[in-house]
Interface confidence: medium
């Protein structure tokens, strides 16, 4: 409530960014070249879902994993290649609905 | 050899004020992620906070006790690493560790590899 | 914040023996975890990363397991350096956080 003699106004409902409580973090071997890969995937994410937490880290020789909230829901060392796009921001769309999140198999070869 | 030195520790009354520094040698500092951590007398390590590489956006992120009253900054000129403590109370007097909390190179993956010695701050009347 | 609970507190052992500090989570952290080592006086240094990745130099009588929200420290055969106070702490979070350490004293 407010100072005595002063009226409260109550504030507008804040507004919630998309993707608000999705925690990333993608592991990456830099010396392989796969900062492009991840900077890509991760601009699209950020467009797509302004509020989401995405963090990079150095992984070992031929790394690219991700993670959401957690979850490992794609590795480059089974599945072969990258993700696609489509595929990563449809699994942000499922974490941030609350929804079961399954492994992406789907993969594309680096460009 | 990568080197992180401490400064700036003393004696100092509740509700004053104190920076400490931290040089950091060996690495390329500005690709570097740095952190604080400190260790009250007799007790375990704490977390204090943390500032990001400038290309990672400079951010920062702190620990809940000392979020409002300390301020993190770097100057990647002077390869160093600051901690602008203010409304110091008894509690936060310990010894203050600045550490490596994720380096941009393949030599340095994850944690806090790299450590300085430790500056000692006492807080007392 | 995330919390990190450490134990047993104390832990008293022989050289040789084998000994388990266990360390968990209030939430899942995947496998960003670490330990270190840390001896009077002196800064802590990391032994393990990631669960369960030895860090450059450390013997390999270290051992470190565990994801999601329990994680183990293990030692084998016991060496007289080894009596010291170990962490773990956790780096999922923005907010790092350390367990409240165990220390593993001579018996």
């Known amino acids: 409530s407010g100072e005595p003699g002063q009226t409260s106004v109550a504030p507008p409902p804040e507004e919630v960014e998309p993707g608000s409580g999705v925690r990333i973090v993608v592991e990456y071997c830099e010396p392989c070249g796969f900062e492009a890969t991840y900077l890509e995937l991760a601009s699209a994410v950020k467009e797509q879902y302004p509020g989401i937490e995405i963090e990079s880290r150095l992984g070992g020789t031929g790394a690219f994993e991700i993670e959401i909230n957690g979850q490992l829901v794609f590795s480059k060392l089974e599945n072969g290649g990258f993700p696609y796009e489509k595929d990563l921001i449809e699994a942000i769309r499922r974490a941030s609905n609350g929804e079961t999140l399954e492994k992406i198999t789907n993969s594309r070869p680096p460009c | 050899e990568v080197q992180l030195v401490e400064s700036g520790g003393g004696l100092v009354k509740p509700g004053g004020s104190l920076r400490l520094s931290c040089e950091v040698s060996?690495?390329?500092?500005?690709?570097?992620?740095m952190s604080w951590v400190r260790q009250a007398p007799g007790k375990g390590l704490e977390w204090v906070g943390r500032?990001?590489?400038?290309?990672?956006?400079?951010?920062?992120d702190y620990a809940a006790p000392v979020k409002g009253r300390f301020t993190i900054s770097r100057d990647d000129s002077k390869n160093t690493l600051y901690l602008q403590m203010n409304s110091l109370k008894t509690e936060d007097t310990a010894v203050y560790y600045c550490?490596?909390?994720?380096?941009?190179?393949?030599?340095?993956?994850?944690?806090?590899?790299?450590w300085g010695q430790g500056t000692t701050v006492t807080v007392s009347s | 914040d995330i919390q990190m609970t450490q134990s047993p507190a104390t832990l008293s052992a022989s050289v040789g023996d084998r000994v388990t500090i266990t360390c968990r989570a209030s939430q899942s952290i995947s496998r960003w975890l670490a330990w270190y080592q840390q001896k009077p006086g002196q800064a802590p240094k990391v032994l393990i990363y990631?669960?369960?990745t030895l860090q450059s130099g450390v013997p390999s009588r270290f051992s470190g397991s565990g994801s999601g929200t329990e994680f183990s420290l293990t030692i084998n055969s016991l060496q007289p350096d080894d009596f010291a106070t170990y962490y773990c702490?956790?780096?999922?979070?923005?907010?790092?956080?350390f367990g409240q350490g165990t220390k593993l004293e001579i018996k």
């Open positions: 990631k669960a369960s």
């Open positions: 060996g690495i390329t500092f500005s690709n570097a992620w």
């Open positions: 550490s490596i909390g994720y380096y941009y190179d393949s030599s340095f993956k994850y944690g806090m590899d790299v």
């Open positions: 702490q956790q780096y999922y979070s923005y907010l790092r956080t």
């Open positions: 500032i990001k590489s400038k290309t990672d956006g400079g951010t920062t």
